[in-house]
């Protein structure tokens, strides 16, 4: 927790941010909360980015004030205006770009004082993997596909029955650049699969970790997948 200290007689107010990651091409949230103030017209929210001359976003007197906004953020930012009164200064960032990564400062002024907190924002691409039985292959084979990742992730296979086994010798992973020349499609194939077992395809980079599970029995196939961002920590 980082507490913003007041300057020149004003009290300090607590401002809290959460490090987060943005999925390029999609919308992201830069999270920031502060001690609420009942005087909405006195609240000022400023978002700044290290190395950027203009403001990322400014909200004051109940509305956006974008005259000082940096060109790279033009038309891409918004606060949750109806939530400001209860202490939510989070910023919605539209169409996240790779270049949006960096250190942001959420700076708050209220009638009670001032405070700020920094936020590390990572950008990349991450997506949910899907594991399927590859019926085209000559032997029992699983195929794990995830459409968008960046930076290039690692792919590791695991199995419930053979816990701790190393599947690198019986798997093959490829990365195919997508049309926008940044993100890549991940395809990993696992050979010599046995029936009545649960296999997991784990894809991970420094931003996210995703797992696709498949359970193959004689009568049915069950799939499950989940994705987790790695660097969400409060400041």
């Amino acid at each position: 927790l980082i507490i913003g200290f007041g300057i020149s007689g004003r009290h300090s107010i607590t401002v809290t941010t959460v490090a987060s990651a943005g999925n390029i091409g999609e919308d992201g949230i830069l999270s920031c909360t502060f001690e609420p103030d009942i005087k909405l017209s006195d609240i000022v929210i400023q978002w700044l980015k290290e190395g950027v001359l203009g403001l990322v976003h400014e909200f004051k007197e109940g509305k956006d004030e974008l005259s000082e906004q940096d060109e790279m953020f033009r038309g891409r930012t918004a606060v949750f205006a109806d939530q400001v009164i209860v202490g939510n200064a989070s910023l919605r960032l539209k169409n996240v770009q790779l270049t949006d990564a960096g250190t942001y400062k959420c700076y708050i002024i209220t009638s009670k004082g001032k405070g700020n907190a920094n936020l590390e924002y990572k950008t990349g691409a991450f997506s949910m993997p899907e594991v399927n039985v590859d019926y085209n292959a000559s032997s029992e084979t699983l195929r794990c596909e995830a459409p968008r990742w960046f930076p290039q992730p690692t792919v590791v296979w695991a199995s419930q029955v053979d816990q701790g086994a190393n599947f690198s010798e019986v798997s093959n992973t490829s990365f195919e650049l997508n049309s926008e020349n940044v993100t890549m499609k991940v395809v990993s194939v696992l050979y010599n699969v046995t029936i009545n077992n649960t296999y997991s395809c784990m894809i991970e980079n420094d931003i996210a970790k995703a797992t696709g599970d498949i359970k193959v029995t004689e009568s049915e196939i069950k799939r499950r997948s989940h994705l987790q961002l790695l660097n969400s920590k409060a400041s």
Epitope: E35, P36, I38, K39, L40, S41, D42, E61, G62, K63, A81, D82, Q83, I85, V86, G87, S111, K112
Partner: antibody, heavy 117, light 107 residues
Framework: EVQLQQSGTVLARPGASVKMSCKVS????????MHWVKQRPGQGLEWIGA????????EYNPNFKGKAKLTAVTSATTAYMELSSLTNEDSAVYYC??????????WGQGTTLTVSS | EIQMTQSPSSMSASLGDRITITCQAT??????LNWYQQKPGKPPSFLIY???QLAEGVPSRFSGSGSGSDYSLTISNLESEDFADYYC?????????FGGGTKLEIK
């Protein structure tokens, strides 16, 4: 579930003081403003003031400065309002109301104060 | 202090009608306006926030609109449970102030 439970009906003499309570459950009491609103019989709503329990900060409607005193006991998640030098004009229903997700989003059931000699 | 002028102060309507209540502020309140419904002997209940957003559980026949200093609450296809008192609240500038209220009665 958010609940604001207010103390019961009060009968008081002119010139006396009364203290009413508002017990909060279901949200982080210390981190959000708690407000008090007055409603005279058959009349509209009038904002009295608010308290931020985490720091005991208070804000008052100028019309109620010296009339109302707001306090809170964080360990009991309870807000209090004391009204002093009571007159007939103070006879009303008094509501506590939170600003948790939005301004005045949850309300207590009200405390009826009757001032009579 | 911002004054909120609510009109009409009372009105009667029939089931199925569409009605509109207005609130005018003495200055621009930048959409910082909520609406509340109150039934006899009960506390007000949260209806609409930030001019046009419906509070949880509020039927879609209720809607709010406005900007600057002029705001309105519309109820379309009135139902029996809608007959009550309605109040607007501005929270843009200190102190927060309510409109005088509108009593909606059945015709």
């Amino acid at each position: 579930e958010v609940q604001l439970q207010q103390s019961g009906t009060v009968l008081a003499r002119p010139g006396a003081s009364v203290k009413m309570s508002c017990k909060v459950s279901g949200y982080p009491f210390t981190s959000y403003w708690m407000h008090w609103v007055k409603q005279r019989p058959g009349q509209g709503l009038e904002w009295i003031g608010a308290i931020y329990p985490g720091k005991s900060d208070t804000e008052y409607n100028p019309n109620f400065k010296g009339k109302a005193k707001l306090t809170a006991v964080t360990s009991a998640t309870t807000a209090y309002m004391e009204l002093s030098s009571l007159t007939n004009e103070d006879s009303a229903v008094y509501y506590c109301t939170s600003t948790w997700t939005h301004y005045f989003d949850y309300w207590g059931q009200g405390t009826t104060l009757t001032v009579s000699s | 202090e911002i004054q909120m002028t609510q009109s009409p102060s009372s009105m009667s309507a029939s089931l199925g009608d569409r009605i509109t209540i207005t609130c005018q502020a003495t200055q621009d309140i930048v959409k910082s306006l909520n609406w509340y419904q109150q039934k006899p002997g009960k506390p007000p209940s949260f209806l609409i926030y930030y001019t046009a957003q419906l509070a949880e559980g509020v039927p879609s026949r209720f809607s709010g609109s406005g900007s600057g200093s002029d705001y309105s609450l519309t109820i379309s296809n009135l139902e029996s449970e809608d007959f009550a008192d309605y109040y607007c609240l501005q929270f843009y500038e200190f102190p927060p102030t309510f409109g005088g209220g509108t009593k909606l009665e059945i015709k």
